[in-house]
Interface confidence: low
């Protein structure tokens, strides 16, 4: 067969969907891969071909759009399932061509199952709610195109598995829930079930999303810094190894960067000719604020390691610090016969 | 890295035509729109027309349809702009920019090409 | 067509100060496929902004975009030497494209 720009599989789009239920896939070409769109493409005279690959086999097959009912269909850039089967599951690949371009990718689809609890192999997005901030909301995710907006369909909100009715502070109002206050106890798995008709038939539209209570914006601080500090004096002779934990708090700050680095001599370790190795450890609480441990080990230290200014710093969006560690090197004790002997004038 | 490279100035009379080419190098070529933009001296940018290289079919803007033809050639990664029937007021830096793929805005643009059009 | 007018026409600033450009289009752009495009003396412009708000690659974060709709803003937070230039903005949302006429920020 003639050259085609194959984009091989794209494993960024893993697309899971549930049994029996509606499914639209755009082709993924039009939304990563080129610079057009379907309707540009389709007015130039290149044409859509679908195609796929069952699981566990090797052979491309075309797909049946002559189903009964008309299961599987395509609409411009979508394939449409009303409804899956657990048995769609596979490699699915989309193809632009005419007799002189052709471009295609692959993506995976994967038919899961669900049990009356919503639980499922189905990866959950995540939704971070702040704690105690006031009202906030979560959408029902991913529903639009299924129906037009001229049908209404009914929206059935759970946690876990039950129904969301007479909660104290989460109130269903349509496609979205309202937390009125978010607290911890708010923290596990919300589905939204819609429902609605599509030629005489009824399609149920499965949407679940873990919500996590974070750290609220007004509580959040810049980086503390809480080792080394002015109470720890690092004490070390020649030849012993020194170690310095650096540990630092911080806020949870929705898409913040945290950092930790440390400097010696206002370089970085990788710039210094020592052997330093620095290791990390990263604990979260229950609301996501982060403690971050570098310690900084030198195996056998020298004097003038010893002279050197070791310095910790922090950064987050709320701001940069910074504090150095006291090291000194350890004056040895006294020997008997030579030092006091000296001192008391004996020859 | 994808750079544009454009060809070298030029003068020309009234009433004839000239041709400006954009070569592209080191990237993908045929699937993103190459456009033009030129610049009378002292004045501002404006958009003349653009060519996506897979479809070869180019739009232009309305006061240039009829003088303006834009032209891909994909194996020389090559676009292409021909303007006829030259007046004094087309005196202009001609410029060729990438329409991009992540920002579908003009994230590359050529170093510009003069064309002087002088009796 | 969409007519972005750009204001004001030039920018007397010095370095350090803050720069707030404005354009308005005649019409809504769809999209929001607006961008904003930096212009040095004898150079080819620079894309700095696209989709009203989204820094192009390797501009420094100084520069950022806001507005919808018809109304757009281009600020500059802290003004370096190198940033007194001729500003454009730009809809790529409906053909024609159409640009705006340029503010010039210049040094005071």
């Known amino acids: 067969s003639e050259r085609c720009d194959d984009w091989g599989l794209d494993t960024m789009r893993q697309i899971q969907v549930f049994e029996d239920e509606p499914a639209r896939i755009k082709c993924p070409l039009f939304e990563h891969f080129l610079k057009f769109n379907y309707s540009t493409a389709h007015s130039a005279g290149l044409t859509l071909i679908w195609y796929w690959t069952r699981q566990d086999r090797d052979l491309e097959e075309p797909i049946n759009f002559r189903l009964p009912e008309n299961r599987i269909s395509k609409e411009k850039d979508v394939l449409w399932f009303r409804p899956t089967l657990l048995n769609d599951t596979g490699n699915y690949t989309c193809m632009l061509r005419n007799t002189t371009y052709c471009s295609k990718v692959a993506f995976p689809l994967e038919v899961v199952q669900k049990d009356s609890c919503f639980n499922s192999p189905m990866k959950l997005p995540v939704h971070k709610l702040y704690i105690e901030y006031g009202i906030q909301r979560i959408t029902c995710p991913n529903v639009d195109g299924y129906f037009p907006s001229s049908v209404k369909p009914t929206i059935t909100w759970y946690m876990g598995c039950y129904k969301i009715q007479n909660f104290n502070n989460v109130i269903p109002e349509g496609m979205n829930l309202s937390f009125l206050i978010a607290f911890i106890s708010n923290n596990g798995n919300y589905t939204c079930v819609v429902t609605y008709p599509e030629n005489g038939r009824t399609f149920h539209l499965t949407r679940t999303l873990t919500v996590k209570v974070v750290g609220s914006p007004k509580n959040a601080v810049p980086p503390v810094i809480h080792s080394p500090n002015d109470h720890v004096v690092y004490e070390k002779e020649p030849g012993e190894e020194l170690l310095i934990p650096c540990t630092v708090y911080f806020s949870f700050l929705m898409d913040s960067r945290n950092e930790v680095w440390w400097t010696i001599d206002g370089k970085k370790p990788d710039d210094i000719p020592i052997d330093v190795t620095i290791n990390e450890s990263i604990s979260h609480s229950r609301t996501e604020d982060e403690t971050r441990t570098q310690i900084l080990s030198i195996k056998k230290v020298t004097s003038e390691d010893l002279k050197r200014s070791y310095v910790c710093h922090a950064r987050s969006a709320k701001g940069e610090v910074a504090k150095a560690a006291t090291v000194k090197q350890k004056v040895p004790a006294p020997r008997y016969t030579v030092e006091l002997a000296c001192g008391f004038g004996a020859t | 890295q994808v750079q544009l490279l454009q060809s070298g100035a030029e003068v020309k009379k009234p009433g004839s035509s000239v041709k400006v080419s954009c070569k592209a190098s080191?990237?993908?070529?045929?699937?993103?729109?190459i456009d033009w933009v030129r610049q009378a001296p002292g004045q501002g940018l404006e958009w003349m027309g653009g060519?996506?290289?897979?479809?070869?079919?180019?739009n232009s803007a309305q006061k240039f349809q009829g003088r303006v033809t834009i032209t891909a050639d994909k194996s020389t990664s090559t676009a292409y702009m021909e303007l006829s029937s030259l007046r004094s007021e087309d005196t202009a830096v001609y410029y060729c920019?990438?329409?991009?793929?992540?920002?579908?805005?003009?994230?590359?643009w050529g170093q510009g090409t003069m064309v002087t059009v002088s009796s | 067509e969409i007519v972005l007018t750009q204001s004001p026409g030039t920018l007397s600033l010095s370095p350090g100060e803050r720069a707030t450009l404005s354009c308005r289009a005649s019409?809504?752009?769809?999209?929001?496929?607006l961008a904003w495009f930096q212009q040095r003396p004898g150079q080819a412009p620079r894309l700095l902004i696209y989709?009203?708000?989204r820094r192009a690659t390797g501009i420094p974060d100084r520069f950022s975009g806001s507005g919808s709709g018809t109304d757009f803003t281009l600020t500059i937070s802290r003004l370096e030497p190198e940033d007194f230039a001729v500003y454009y903005c730009?809809?790529?949302?409906?053909?024609?494209?159409?640009f705006g006429g340029g503010t010039k920020v210049e040094i005071k």
């Open positions: 920019a990438r329409n991009g793929a992540t920002s579908d805005a003009f994230d590359m």
């Open positions: 080191g990237g993908t070529f045929s699937i993103y729109a």
């Open positions: 060519i996506i290289p897979i479809f070869g079919t180019a």
């Open positions: 019409l809504s752009v769809s999209s929001n496929y």
């Open positions: 989709g009203v708000s």
């Open positions: 730009q809809q790529y949302g409906s053909s024609p494209l159409t």
